[in-house]
């Protein structure tokens, strides 16, 4: 059943669910700061547009009475609890800034008819794809699978002349929330990645991963994993690695690669890092001072969520349209709005598009260098470094299956 | 975090969660009647034992504000919601008569530290196995898999001289809650059933099922499905069936086979029905007058849940032991108590044991007849009809794989 909304007569509210369980271990004060910074910007933009309205956020906190707190694995019902709280308090805004945990978001769509828009800084899993009123402001797993398939198939770059069709995936279950769902999507037999590969095997034990590095009978030279360089080092250490092994390290929400004076450790030489280019303006933002490089994207997603709310409000008010309609609920997609850090594009399903960046370690400079970029909006790869100083033979990525000649 | 309990000083309460979402579409009044009938019996038993205490139930209803109502598929968070409600109202009893939906029960264990005992009339899925404070009073999926594996392997009965190691499973997703989890357990690659079979294929489309019935290239003669005869008829109709096909119809909670004047329709001749023998006393019970044959077991499980609560209360009070301890919470297992209908045995994991009954259709009398019984407690099959009047050749069950001679 539906909940009455604080969303009319010149007063517009966004309900922000402040969850005990979150995709990133970010203090809730930082999230609140990001939201408030966003509200300031929105008020300014609406005022500049001659729209004299009040815009606020109501923060709904979990009471922590019965939930195991912490990561997303025990978050399933927390979003629904907060929705019930909102419903009892008659405090639903025009928009819900919802859970970042996939389990929680999925459950809200499973158990209720959500007829108002929900914005999420997370909800990475495939189970949150194609939700008609959900907008996700951090790259969901589906976008990762699109990149990987595109990159695997690519064979027309100076440094990649082989199409790949095989892969190992390392997934030990201790991953962060984003990695957990990214790897789930690669593992899922129904996913695009699995569908397009002729061989894929999930490695779950450290030893399995370590053995593959020098195994002459391995079925693929490519290993996908998710985490930061430290995570890889714990696993790989300084072990020898066969010369045609390529490790793809997915680390989308980590700006550290772009910081000054960062040197790539030696164990990263066989590794391509998939990340996103950082937004500069955020580095100097008032609310981001206490944020680690891995947290900026999360805070930024909250901030951009508020700006998106403002953008939609402005659009509908300027057109004299009602905000509490299904049309509004379904409108948070297939658009570009002015984010904190530049234009933000949402696809037909409300998922953020971005430019992913594939980095390699230069054997000359020991620096991370951009190999190529990938635009998720048009599913297109653009080579950046035409002659990378790779560790691999002839400065080209090897084939995914080593030709061992007659056996 | 824990909730204070109404469970001391001679006053003992059981909290009964009255869910919108339930494993069986049973009006909540009937559940309430069953609980109240149980309380009357418990009060009598405690009085007879010289224990002068008050025993009550508090019924906790969902407010229906945000949940999709109906079946268990959207029940995940309802149990937690009610637990939150209990927690806010400070109304937790000594025991929780919890959700019947697997999703809901599983989530309660996932998201909270349940340190009080929970009794469920349902929670059939494998994901609710081995929960230290959960007692299930209707046969869970694990027990079904034990029977099937035992029966498949059996080859020393007059009417079954072949071990089977293959099966089709029909599962189209429209099943009732019990069937949904029973079939899930057969489908799951990690389950005992899958583990012990050399071939197993899930048929999801009606046409797949219908084609198998006469397919010369089928990989197994055995098809497991779940539902009542009507469900089978909708699927199979009056189609011809190869003579060595055996359909196992799982219909555990349906007493209609044992009613007087029931004739087995012709389409049931290739079918073995797995059910449970009904309790006679329930048929004349005051609260069961409005119950259909398929609902009696559900109501009985609630009634027996109250009797189990009474039994444990009596045991602990007679021994002068504290009720609000972990010992009490973990004690609802590995015991036999006096149920409404005779002794009820719980295994080491708090799951009810029962006598399953395999029925066949006599080609002479067109009646359902008991072929064998299976005691889940000792994992033992007892043949009942040594010379069944089967439809199958030589009145013996065929091999699961037809020998087609040289191809």
């Amino acid at each position: 059943s539906q909940v009455s909304q604080n969303c009319h007569n010149g007063s517009y509210e966004i309900s922000v669910l402040m969850m005990d369980n979150s995709a990133f271990a970010e203090p809730l004060e930082n999230v609140e700061d990001a939201v408030n910074e966003g509200l300031e910007i929105v008020r300014g933009r609406l005022q500049n547009a001659g729209l004299n309205v009040t815009v606020n956020a109501s923060f709904m906190y979990s009471d922590g009475l019965i939930h195991n707190s912490g990561d997303c694995r025990s978050s399933t019902c927390e979003g629904l609890d907060l929705l019930r709280k909102i419903s009892n308090a008659k405090r639903m805004g025009c928009v819900l800034m919802g859970p970042s945990c996939t389990y929680s978001t999925f459950q809200m769509y499973l158990d209720t008819e959500l007829s108002y828009p929900m914005i999420s800084a997370g909800s990475f899993g495939l189970s949150c794809d194609y939700k008609e009123t959900l907008t996700r402001l951090m790259s969901p797993a589906r976008k990762l699978t699109y990149f990987l398939v595109n990159f695997w198939k690519t064979n027309d770059l100076p440094f990649k002349t082989y199409s790949w069709s095989t892969s190992y995936v390392y997934k030990n279950g201790t991953e962060s929330e984003d990695c957990f769902w990214y790897l789930n999507a690669l593992e899922a037999s129904v996913s695009y990645f699995s569908h397009e590969l002729s061989f894929k095997l999930v490695l779950r034990q450290d030893k399995e991963f370590q053995d593959i590095l020098m195994d002459h009978n391995r079925k693929s030279n490519v290993i996908v994993m998710c985490g930061d360089p430290q995570f890889l080092y714990k696993l790989k250490g300084d072990r020898a690695v066969a010369e045609d092994i390529v490790i793809i390290l997915v680390d989308l929400f980590n700006d550290q690669y772009f910081e000054d004076n960062v040197t790539a450790p030696d164990y990263m030489k066989n590794v391509l890092v998939l990340t996103q280019s950082p937004g500069n303006s955020l580095l100097n933002s008032s609310f981001s001072r206490n944020l680690s490089p891995t947290k900026r994207d999360f805070a930024l997603a909250y901030l951009n969520g508020i700006l998106l709310f403002g953008h939609m409000l402005k659009t509908f008010l300027e057109n004299g349209e009602n905000i509490t309609t299904p049309k509004f609920a379904h409108a948070f997609r297939n658009l570009t709005f002015e984010g904190y850090d530049g234009p933000v594009t949402l696809d037909d399903w409300g998922d953020v598009d971005s430019t992913m960046v594939l980095l390699y370690t230069s054997v000359d400079t020991k620096k991370y260098k951009v190999l190529l970029t990938y635009d998720t909006h048009v599913n297109q790869t653009n080579p950046v470094d035409m002659s990378p100083t790779f560790t691999w033979k002839n400065s080209k990525l090897p084939n995914d299956i080593t030709d061992r000649g007659p056996q | 975090s824990q909730v204070s309990q109404n469970c001391h000083n001679g006053s003992y309460e059981i909290s009964v969660l009255m869910m919108d979402n339930s494993a069986f579409a049973e009006p909540l009044e009937n559940v309430e009647d069953a609980v109240n009938e149980g309380l009357e019996i418990v009060r009598g038993r405690l009085q007879n034992a010289g224990l002068n205490v008050t025993v009550n139930a508090s019924f906790m209803y969902s407010d229906g504000l945000i949940h999709n109502s109906g079946d268990c598929r959207s029940s995940t968070c309802e149990g937690l919601d009610l637990l939150r409600k209990i927690s806010n109202a400070k109304r937790m009893g000594c025991v929780l008569m919890g959700p019947s939906c697997t999703y809901s029960t599983f989530q309660m264990y996932l998201d909270t530290e349940l340190s009080y005992p929970m009794i469920s009339a349902g929670s059939f899925g494998l994901s609710c196995d081995y929960k230290e404070t959960l007692t299930r009073l209707m046969s869970p999926a694990r027990k079904l898999t034990y029977f099937l594996v035992n029966f498949w392997k059996t080859n020393d009965l007059p009417f079954k001289t072949y071990s089977w190691s293959t099966s089709y499973v029909y599962k189209n997703g429209t099943e009732s809650e019990d069937c949904f989890w029973y079939l899930n357990a057969l489908e799951a690659s990690v389950s005992y059933f899958s583990h012990e079979l050399s071939f197993k294929l899930v048929l999801r489309q009606d046409k797949e099922f219908q084609d198998i019935l006469m397919d010369h290239n089928r990989k197994s003669n055995v098809i497991v499905m779940c539902g009542d005869p009507q469900f089978l008829y909708k699927l199979k109709g009056d189609r011809a069936v190869a003579e060595d096909i055996v359909i196992i119809l799982v219909d555990l909670f349906n007493d209609q086979y044992f009613e007087d004047n029931v004739t087995a329709p012709d389409y049931m001749k290739n079918v073995l029905v797995l059910t449970q023998s009904p309790g006679n006393s329930l048929l004349n019970s005051s609260f069961s007058r409005n119950l259909s044959p398929t609902k009696r077991d559900f109501a009985l499980a609630y009634l027996n849940g109250i009797l189990l609560f009474g039994h444990m209360l009596k045991t602990f009070l007679e021994n002068g032991e504290n009720i609000t301890t972990p010992k009490f919470a973990h004690a609802f297992r590995n015991l036999t108590f006096e149920g409404y209908d005779g002794p009820v045995t719980l295994d080491d994991w708090g799951d009810v044991d029962s006598t399953m009954v395999l029925l066949y259709t006599s080609v002479d009398t067109k009646k359902y007849k008991v072929l064998l019984t299976y005691d889940t407690h000792v994992n033992q099959t007892n043949p009942v009809d040594m010379s069944p009047t089967f439809t199958w050749k030589n009145s013996k069950l065929p091999n699961d794989i037809t020998d087609r001679g040289p191809q």
Epitope: K153, T161, V370, D385 | -
Partner: antibody, heavy 118, light 113 residues
Framework: QVQLVQSGAEVKKPGASVKVSCKAS????????MHWVRQAPGQGLEWMGI????????SYAQEFQGRVTMTRDTSTSTVYMELSSLRSEDTAVYYC???????????WGQGTLVTVSS | DIVMTQSPLSLPVTLGQPASISCRSS????????????LSWYHQRPGQSPRRLIY???NRDSGVPDRFSGSGSDTDFTLKISRVETEDVGIYYC?????????FGQGTKVEIK
């Protein structure tokens, strides 16, 4: 409209180097890769290499590796192709060609004739 | 590298008559990563730069007369001129951009009989 204007014809002695320029206009210079293609008299087209004007990175055809250098100047929207250790068989018309979509040459310069003769 | 083989190498044609040039690649030109086939045709008049006529097998560039059409798939491609005109003389090149590095056919010289 898109225009690629190349420098004029050159006559060089064997062993010398030549540097040909290609000035782009009518589009965002750093948004499109640039290729160099040459054509010896009466012969077909031969791809020489590619430059990314955005970062300056390059990739060259195997047969020119070590002899060719491609550079760019973003301030003047110009790319350069320098070929060293010239031999008589390097006599050809050298074209710059814009990459409209990866490895698709949509616009060509007018060509620069380089003659290598002693 | 992918080898592109054109035939014929020389094509004398009558004005107003159709003409057809074939181009064969040593490997499939279907680019797996996006499902497109990057085969283009270029026309070079005597003393001029090449000009693109067709891209992605069959798409005509703007300003290219509709008497030019491209077809084919996998490894076999064809450029057709429905009615040859005087300005169509010159050399026609096919080029593949589906694999690295890009490669050209050796050219087909079209002249009026």
């Amino acid at each position: 409209q898109v225009q690629l204007v190349q420098s004029g014809a050159e006559v060089k002695k064997p062993g010398a180097s030549v540097k040909v320029s290609c000035k782009a206009s009518g589009y965002t210079f750093t948004s499109y890769y640039m290729h160099w293609v040459r054509q010896a008299p009466g012969q077909g087209l031969e791809w020489m290499g590619i430059i990314n004007p955005s970062g300056g990175s390059t990739s060259y055809a195997q047969e020119f590796q070590g002899r060719v250098t491609m550079t760019r100047d973003t301030s003047t929207s110009t790319v350069y192709m320098e070929l060293s250790s010239l031999r008589s068989e390097d006599t050809a018309v050298y074209y710059c060609a814009r990459d409209g979509q990866w490895l698709q040459f949509d616009y060509w310069g007018q060509g620069t004739l380089v003659t290598v003769s002693s | 590298d992918i080898v592109m083989t054109q035939s014929p190498l020389s094509l004398p044609v009558t004005l107003g008559q159709p003409a057809s040039i074939s181009c064969r690649s040593s490997q499939s030109l279907l680019k797996k990563s996006d499902g497109n086939t990057y085969l283009s045709w270029y026309h070079q008049r005597p003393g001029q730069s090449p000009r693109r006529l067709i891209y992605k097998v069959s798409n005509r560039d703007s300003g290219v007369p509709d008497r030019f059409s491209g077809s084919g798939s996998d490894t076999d491609f064809t450029l057709k001129i429905s009615r040859v005109e005087t300005e169509d003389v010159g050399i026609y090149y096919c080029m593949q951009g589906s694999h690295w590095p890009p490669t050209f056919g050796q050219g087909t010289k079209v002249e009026i009989k």
